[in-house]
Structures are given as C-alpha cells and as structure tokens.
Interface confidence: low
C-alpha cells in the first residue's frame, strides 16, 4: 500500500518516513542477483558512509524488491541532506543514488479515530483521533473524507475536506451572542427557544471544519442523519514535507436530530432553575438531559456527561397524551447549557435531539406584565404597566396587541425599549381587547416572550401607532 502512495515519486530509490524518526527505503531490480550483490550506503555531510541492512522479497512477474529500514533512530536526522546510493558489490558500480532530506519524505500512518459523536450544536460532529506519532502531530495536516451513510445507496455523495487548524476551541464557541439588537427592539434573534427554519442539507462545500490538536469539529451536516468518515494525514509542507498517508478505517456515527423539530424551549424565571419543554410525541416517551460546559476550557477530547433533567409532573392526569413534556434542573451562570432530548418510540428505538447551547442569561423568561389604562379624554387612552423585573428595565421590550370585539385578527404594537407606558388615540364608542407581553432583549439578558396578560377590555379602540 505504501508503494502505491509513492507512485508519483519518480526516483528509482524510494524512501519514506512514518514518524520522522524512522526511514524506510526500497528499490526494485528486474534481475535476480545473487544474495549480497547490493549494498545500500548512506552518509550525512562530512560523515563516513554506513551500510543499511537489506532485506529482499520476490516480486511476482517482475524481480526482487530490496528494502532497508534504518536500524537506529539516531541515524535519522531532520534538516540535513542524506546521500543514499546503491552499490553493486560485485561489479563495483553505483546502481542508483539520491540525496534527500528525511523531513521531506513523510508518509504518515493513518490516525485512528477513537471517537465520533454529535457536537454541541445540531448538525455538528465532533471527531477525536489518536496520532500514531503524537510528537509530530503539530507538523501534520489532516484531511477528512465523509458522506451520508445510506444502506440503499453505497455511492452517496462524498466530501473530502482539509481540516483547518485553529487556535481556538471550536466546539466551545460562545453560543448565539445577542448582537442583533440594532434591529427593532423586539426583533427575534435566533435563540435556542425559537422555532426557526430547519437546516437544509449542506452542499459539498458548505460544511465547515475546524481542528484542535487531535480533535475536529464539522458543522453544517444534516441533523438526524448517519455519516461515515475517514481521516488521513500529510506533513504540512512547511516544517515537514511528504505525501498523504493512507486513509484510516471508516467509522460511522448517527447525528442527533435538531430539537427545533420538537419545539424545544428552555427558560429560567430566577436565573437559578431552568425549565425546558418540548412537544410530546404520540406513542413515545421522552427524557431530557443537560450538561454544562465552560466557555474557555478546551479539552483535547470532549466527552460530556449528560445529567438527567428532572421530569415535572404531568399537568393533565388521565389517558390523554399531554401536549408538552417539561423538565427542570439547577443551572449556573458561568457555563454554557446544553440540552438533549431522547425520544423512545414504542418498538424501543431511541432518537436523540440536540438543542442549541445557551447561557442562562439568554433564557430569562419574565413574568406576565400587568396592563393598566385610563381614559384621559374622549378617544384618548393612557396605558401604563409595571416592569416585571425592575433590575432589567432598560433591557425589557414589550408587545401590545389589540383587537376589536368580534374580530379575529390582532394588531401588534411595539413600544420603545424600556418604555413604562404610552398613549393611544382611540375611536370612541368601540369595544376592544388589549393584551401585553414582555421579554428581555438587551446586552445582558435575553429570553423568550412571557405569556400574554389577561385580556383588558376597553370601551374604545385605536388604529393609531405609538
């Protein structure tokens, strides 16, 4: 196999190094020469030539292959020219020769993938591998080959992508920072509780790869799909040179689905306890799990320990399947929260669904605000409400909705961020219902909408804006 990888090497005397502390050289002879005909000599500059012990093997329909494995690690030196020549002892001639740098003939042994698992985000895959020669791993680059595992279609699309080495820890990037606040004050950022659009299948170039030592994160994959993958390595071409080694043995992995599909929503009311809820599936049981990760820690291999999210009592006793499953757990404000939901169907098949990671301060749900109103003059209404949380008044935004009695459609107004009230110009002698809800959407705190306040009935209606 190594020979085929060196096919592009036009030198008759072919050499390769697995770890840059070893060297193997070989060449082929058509004639069947007597044993001991050839001697492989080598020398570094200003040093005496030495002989490398040769072994030979018969090549069917061709001749003999002579192989030398350098006997001593100290004889394998980087960054210095190594002169090699094959001498015919009997004929006193040099059969072939070459000058090489050991550091330019690398042919690394394939890394062995020791773990492939879902990453911290839906559609991510975390791979960890062991380098056969860890001391040179900093001087290698890696290539990943992967594709969807489809038993019906063994020739599915294959992606081959170079792994880009990063200094950061890709699997633990800050999740969804709320930087989209320059839109309307209540613009909905992409948060873990949002039922956003499902990820589409990536194009061949769409998936992104990052590496951290012996681990790599692939993103942009299809959540819920199965993939096969292989790794190989090559010297980086800067510090060390050589060729791509062979591919590792393939491994397969099932990616968890995206919990958006279950309508997963997590929130906290007190910045201590987190409640998660998701749609209950028919004829299936489900269980929530969580774990905390530190934003700045960057372990070489990440094997999170998922903890049980404590199930809440069903709110509707009886035979009917509840609409939502809920669970809760104590959290910390210095860690990223990861959520996994396992759904077990009647035959016992388990499907995993991964939520997008979040910080607890990104999931603060406010209590329902109270709406008060009074009519100042005919058709002129003054509204007032208390901030549900005075400690985050400047980060609280509101939505007011109203509808005429007998109408189905609601008009929605968005007061300015942090407003405590407002006025409405009203059309006299009409009946309307008003409701208010609040959410945090500031630089410090964010979260989902509170529930709408109980409908407030007024005798007039507005069509004017704020």
């Amino acid at each position: 196999q190594d020979v085929s990888l060196l096919a592009s090497d036009s030198e008759p005397l072919k050499c390769f190094s697995r770890t840059f502390e070893d060297l193997t050289c070989f060449w082929d002879e058509e004639e069947a020469a007597p044993s001991g005909t050839y001697q492989l000599l080598y020398a570094y500059p200003r040093e005496k030539p030495r002989a490398c012990p040769l072994s030979s093997q018969s090549m069917p329909h061709f001749g003999t292959r002579y192989v030398c494995q350098f006997p001593d690690q100290e004889e394998v030196r980087l960054f210095f020219p190594l002169h090699l020549w094959v001498k015919n002892v009997f004929l006193n001639q040099t059969r072939t020769q070459r000058v090489l740098f050991v550091d330019s003939v690398g042919l690394p042994a394939p890394p062995s993938i020791i773990k492939a698992m879902g990453g911290s985000q839906p559609g991510e895959l975390q791979i960890s591998w062991e380098e056969p020669a860890p001391e040179i791993s900093d001087f290698l680059r890696y290539e990943l080959r992967y594709g969807p595992r489809d038993p019906k279609n063994s020739t599915g699309p294959t992606v081959i992508q170079l792994i880009a080495t990063e200094t950061c820890c890709p699997a633990l990037q800050r999740p969804h920072s709320a930087s989209a606040l320059d839109q309307s004050p209540c613009a909905q950022p992409t948060m873990p509780w949002q039922d956003g659009p499902k990820q589409t299948s990536p194009s061949r170039e769409a998936s992104a790869l990052t590496a951290e030592g012996g681990s790599c994160l692939i993103s942009g994959l299809q959540p819920g799909n199965s993939y096969w993958l292989q790794l190989r390595s090559e010297p980086d071409g800067i510090s060390l040179g050589g060729s791509w080694g062979s591919w590792s043995l393939p491994v397969t992995v099932d990616l968890p689905g995206d919990a958006v599909a279950l309508g997963l929503q997590c929130f906290t009311l007190d910045l201590k306890n987190v409640t998660c809820q998701w749609q209950q599936q028919d004829h299936a049981s489900s269980q929530g799990f969580f774990y905390h990760s530190r934003a700045r820690c960057c372990p070489r291999d990440r094997y999170p320990i998922w903890e049980n999210c404590e199930e809440e009592e069903k709110t509707n006793p009886g035979l009917q399947t509840p609409q939502f499953s809920r669970c809760h757990f104590k959290s910390r404000n210095d860690s990223i929260i990861h959520i996994l939901v396992e759904v077990t169907t009647a035959p016992g098949t388990v499907h995993s669904y991964l939520g997008s990671p979040f910080w607890i301060h990104q999931a603060v749900r406010l209590p329902t605000p109270n709406l008060h109103w009074r009519e100042i003059s005919s058709g002129h209404l003054e509204l007032e409400w208390q901030h549900p949380s005075s400690w985050a008044a400047q980060e609280t935004c509101y939505q007011l909705r109203y509808t005429g009695e007998g109408h189905q459609d609601w008009k929605v107004l968005e007061p300015p961020l942090g407003a405590r009230g407002g006025t409405l110009e009203l059309r006299p002698r009409s009946r309307y219902r008003l409701q208010l809800r609040a959410r945090l959407n500031g630089p410090t705190y964010q979260g989902p909408w509170s529930s709408w306040s109980d409908p407030t009935r007024v005798e007039t209606a507005t069509e004017t804006a704020w």
Epitope: P45, R46, F79, P81, V99, F101, S104, G237, I238, S239
Partner: antibody
Framework: QVQLQESGPGLVKPSQTLSLTCTVS?????????WNWIRQPPGNGLEWIGY???????SYNPSLKSRVLISVDTSKNQVSLKLSSVTAADTAVYYC???????????WGQGTTVTVSS | DVVMTQSPSSLSASVGDRVTITCMAS??????LAWYQQKPGNAPKLLIY???SLETGVPSRFSGSGSGTDFTLTISSLQPEDFATYYC?????????FGGGTKVEIK
C-alpha cells in the same frame, strides 16, 4: 529575543588568518539550531561559508573548505570563524546568521567589515 | 553545487508598480527556496520561506511562487521602503547558494 553580534579586526594582512567571533545572546547555541557564516564582497552578492550545528557538526562551502574552520566557545556562547591564507578576494562584510526551523537564515548579525590589505 | 540564477540583475520601477523577480535553480530544489531583502548597510532580512510562505511581519504585498527549478518573487504595489536588493537562496542541498541579487531602484 535572539541577537547576534559579529566582532573582529577590521584589517587583516594577506596570507594571515582572519578570525571573527559571533556572540549570540538570548539563546544557547548548544541547545538547538545551526549557526552560519555568510560573506558579501563589496558590491557583490552573498556567499555561504559554512555552518556549525548545535551539536558541533560542521559543513563548509567546498570552495573555501581547505581554509575554513568554524568552532564554538560554549562558555561565551560564541561561534568563531577562522579563514586562513587570506587574499584581497576575501575582503567582505562577514555576517553570522542562525539557520532556523525552516532552513532559512531567520536571525542575522549586523555584519562586520574585513579588509585584507598590506 | 546548485547554481541559482536571478534575473534581472537590476530594474527601475515607480511607487505603485507591480514588480516581478525570477530565480532559476540548476536542479530541482523542491520548494526549499527563500527570498531576502537587503538595504544598503544592513543585513539581509527574510521575506519568504518555502518558496511561497510569508515570514511573520512581512507585508502581504510580497508573495512568492514556484517549485522545482523556477521561482518568482512579486511585489504587488511597490512602496518607497521596498527599494533594495533582493536575493533568492536555495537550502535544498549543501552548499547553500544564493542568487546574484536584483537591485530595485527608483525610476
């Protein structure tokens, strides 16, 4: 920060031996790397003279090999160059430089001018 | 010895010009080629290593290309501080050898 500083007589008589030292600060010359001498005759290009490795192995330019000796004084962290039987053709700026991880001369001294004249 | 032939030996150019210097090796040297810049009275300064890799701190207007025997140094937009002499150097086989240099002068 690695720094290299060449020193030696600026004037050498023909047929005598030119002796230069390169004092390395910020790095132990026996720890790693290869230490080179390069020269540049007035108005001309660069010519590699030779090197000594951290372990004491030397390699010289064949064109100067018979006249060159590169050595180290580990106690002073210095690399020395001796060039015997000099002629006017050896008049040049002499540089010492470190051969770095990528085989390139990544740190250089500022150079010292040597004139061979009677 | 590997002979390095650099061309042109000198050139005149204006600020903002694109400048190309070539270096040819007498035998295959893989990508083990460096480019240096030298200003009068100073030691050479490493610009490019491994034929194409930019040394840390060197402006991105400098770029290198080539492998085997033919190599090129390009300055995409010449700046006043770029007027100097440029040398290529092979470090494939001992003795290390330099090109004859290219002097870039103000037109």
């Amino acid at each position: 920060q690695v720094q290299l500083q060449e020193s030696g007589p600026g004037l050498v008589k023909p047929s005598q031996t030119l002796s230069l030292t390169c004092t390395v600060s910020g790095y132990s010359i026996t720890s790693d790397y290869t230490w080179n001498w390069i020269r540049q005759p007035p108005g001309n290009g660069l010519e590699w003279i030779g090197y000594i490795t951290y372990s004491g192995s030397t390699s010289y330019n064949p064109s100067l090999k018979s006249r060159v000796l590169i050595s180290v004084d580990t106690s002073k962290n210095q690399v020395s160059l001796k060039l015997s039987s000099v002629t006017a053709a050896d008049t040049a700026v002499y540089y010492c430089a470190r051969l770095g991880r990528r085989y390139t001369m990544d740190y250089w001294g500022q150079g010292t001018t040597v004139t061979v004249s009677s | 010895d590997v002979v390095m032939t650099q061309s042109p030996s000198s050139l005149s150019a204006s600020v903002g010009d694109r400048v190309t210097i070539t270096c040819m090796a007498s035998e295959d040297i893989y990508i083990r080629l460096a480019w240096y810049q030298q200003k009068p009275g100073n030691a050479p300064k490493l610009l490019i290593y491994a034929a194409t890799s930019l040394e840390t701190g060197v402006p991105s207007r400098f770029s290198g290309s080539g492998s085997g025997t033919d190599f090129t140094l390009t300055i995409s937009s010449l700046q006043p501080e770029d007027f100097a002499t440029y040398y290529c150097q092979q470090y494939w086989s001992s003795p290390w050898t330099f090109g004859g240099g290219t002097k870039v002068e103000i037109k």
